[in-house]
Interface confidence: medium
């Protein structure tokens, strides 16, 4: 009868950070500079990602893991592993799946990130609108007519608005 022989691939012994060098009798050689192997048994090392231009290095490449990039100020990451950098939205806009879109009437965003939020409803606090809202700024609530007496505070800071968390109907 014929005995089965276990043919173990010598390359399977090569750990992460090395490659199985065919030119050197399949011995495990360290990955050259600017390359890496994240798993064992690899016959080549992968070239490290370079974070250039609008990309900046978040994590340096090592012999066992690729470099990780993020975006320079004014841009944010898109795609798997920050494959793209997109310009931050402007004040008065929000990032949607279709890119940066203007806040609709009745909402504002005073930052370059985040979402458009509803203007504060001054009347809920029994106050009146002192300064109208814009796409970039919330309304400023002022005293109600009944409060307009000597010694009364003239401007109340707006209460923090909270996004409804549902679609407009």
């Amino acid at each position: 009868f014929e005995r089965t022989r276990s043919l173990q691939d010598p390359c399977s012994n090569c750990p992460a950070g090395t490659f199985c060098d065919n030119n050197r009798n399949q011995i495990c050689s360290p990955c050259p500079p600017n390359s890496f192997s994240s798993a064992g048994g690899q016959r080549t090392c992968d070239i490290c990602r370079q974070c250039k231009g609008v990309f900046r290095t978040r994590k340096e490449c090592s012999s066992t893991s690729n470099a990780e990039c993020d975006c320079t100020p004014g841009f944010h990451c898109l795609g798997a592993g920050c494959s793209m950098c997109e310009q931050d939205c402007k004040q008065g806009q929000e990032l949607t799946k279709k890119g940066c879109k203007d806040c609709c009437f009745g909402t504002f965003n005073d930052q370059k990130r985040g979402i458009c939020r509803p203007w504060t409803n001054c009347s809920l606090d029994g106050k009146s609108v002192l300064v109208n809202g814009t796409k970039e700024r919330d309304v400023v609530c002022g005293p109600s007519p009944a409060d307009l007496s000597p010694g009364a505070s003239s401007v109340t800071p707006p209460a923090p608005a909270r996004e409804p968390g549902h679609s407009p109907q």
């Epitope: 592993g81 929000e94 203007d102 549902h166």
Partner: antibody, heavy 125, light 112 residues
Framework: QVQLQESGPGLVKPSETLSLTCKVS?????????MCWIRQPPGKGLEWIGC????????YYASWAKGRVTISVDSSKNQFSLKLSSVTAADTAVYYC?????????????????WGQGTLVTVSS | DIQMTQSPSSLSASVGDRVTITCQSS????????LAWYQQKPGKAPKLLIY???NLASGVPSRFSGSGSGTDFTLTISSLQPEDFATYYC????????????FGTGTKVTVL
């Protein structure tokens, strides 16, 4: 009242095609947000199946669903549908339709703010 | 495929306890914060709690809060109430060659 309502057969035979419809009421498909299907096998977690962009009709499917799933929309009837072909017992699940939330400007925001109550579909001969 | 792993998978707690659930994604979510949390009770559809990683959905009590960015996120219930015993799921939105959604593995919160 804003709501979603799934409908379709509760029992499907192996190798056949599962067909479900989601009827939308209280809002219409006039924005560029997505309507989606999500399922949950008994006693297990939620699994995204796919979505359709109600603005341009683009579809997005989970990798496991590509080639087996078709999602379509009928704006005139205010409904959208799911077809899943070549079903097996592993496709037995509660199937939910869900609406992707829209931004103030009417564009998709990536999370689900409205769900149907779910319909159980059993695959068995 | 994108993997979203929640831990713990289950936990037992008492009313009044502070509860923390983590969600780790194998890839960064879109814009680093397109991550939502849902609560699901038996026989019911999931209910949105948190969106964009840290924003409280309408009608959700302030004892719920979310934090995190990129691949690592946390849901915290500051003082557990009887109605909070449920299963919680994270959900990420991704863009590579196309839009993609994924749910976490779930965390079941039960009475100690």
């Amino acid at each position: 009242q804003v709501q979603l309502q799934e409908s379709g057969p509760g029992l499907v035979k192996p190798s056949e095609t599962l067909s479900l419809t989601c009827k939308v009421s209280g809002f219409s498909f006039n924005n560029d947000y997505d309507m989606c299907w999500i399922r949950q096998p008994p006693g297990k977690g939620l699994e995204w199946i796919g979505c359709i962009d109600t603005g341009d009709g683009s579809t997005y499917y989970a990798s496991w669903a590509k080639g087996r799933v078709t999602i379509s929309v009928d704006s005139s009837k205010n409904q959208f549908s799911l077809k899943l072909s070549s079903v097996t017992a592993a496709d037995t699940a509660v199937y939910y339709c869900a609406r992707e939330a829209a931004s103030s400007s009417g564009y998709g925001m990536g999370y689900f703010d409205l769900w149907g109550q779910g319909t159980l579909v059993t695959v068995s001969s | 495929d994108i993997q979203m792993t929640q831990s713990p998978s289950s936990l037992s707690a008492s009313v009044g306890d502070r509860v923390t659930i983590t969600c780790q994604s194998s890839q960064s979510v879109y814009d680093n914060n397109w991550l939502a949390w849902y609560q699901q009770k038996p026989g019911k559809a999931p209910k949105l709690l948190i969106y964009r990683a840290s924003n409280l959905a309408s009608g959700v009590p302030s004892r719920f809060s979310g934090s995190g960015s990129g691949t690592d996120f946390t849901l915290t219930i500051s003082s557990l109430q009887p109605e909070d015993f449920a299963t919680y799921y994270c959900q990420g939105t991704y863009l590579s060659s196309n839009w993609y959604w994924a749910f976490g593995t779930g965390t079941k919160v039960t009475v100690l």
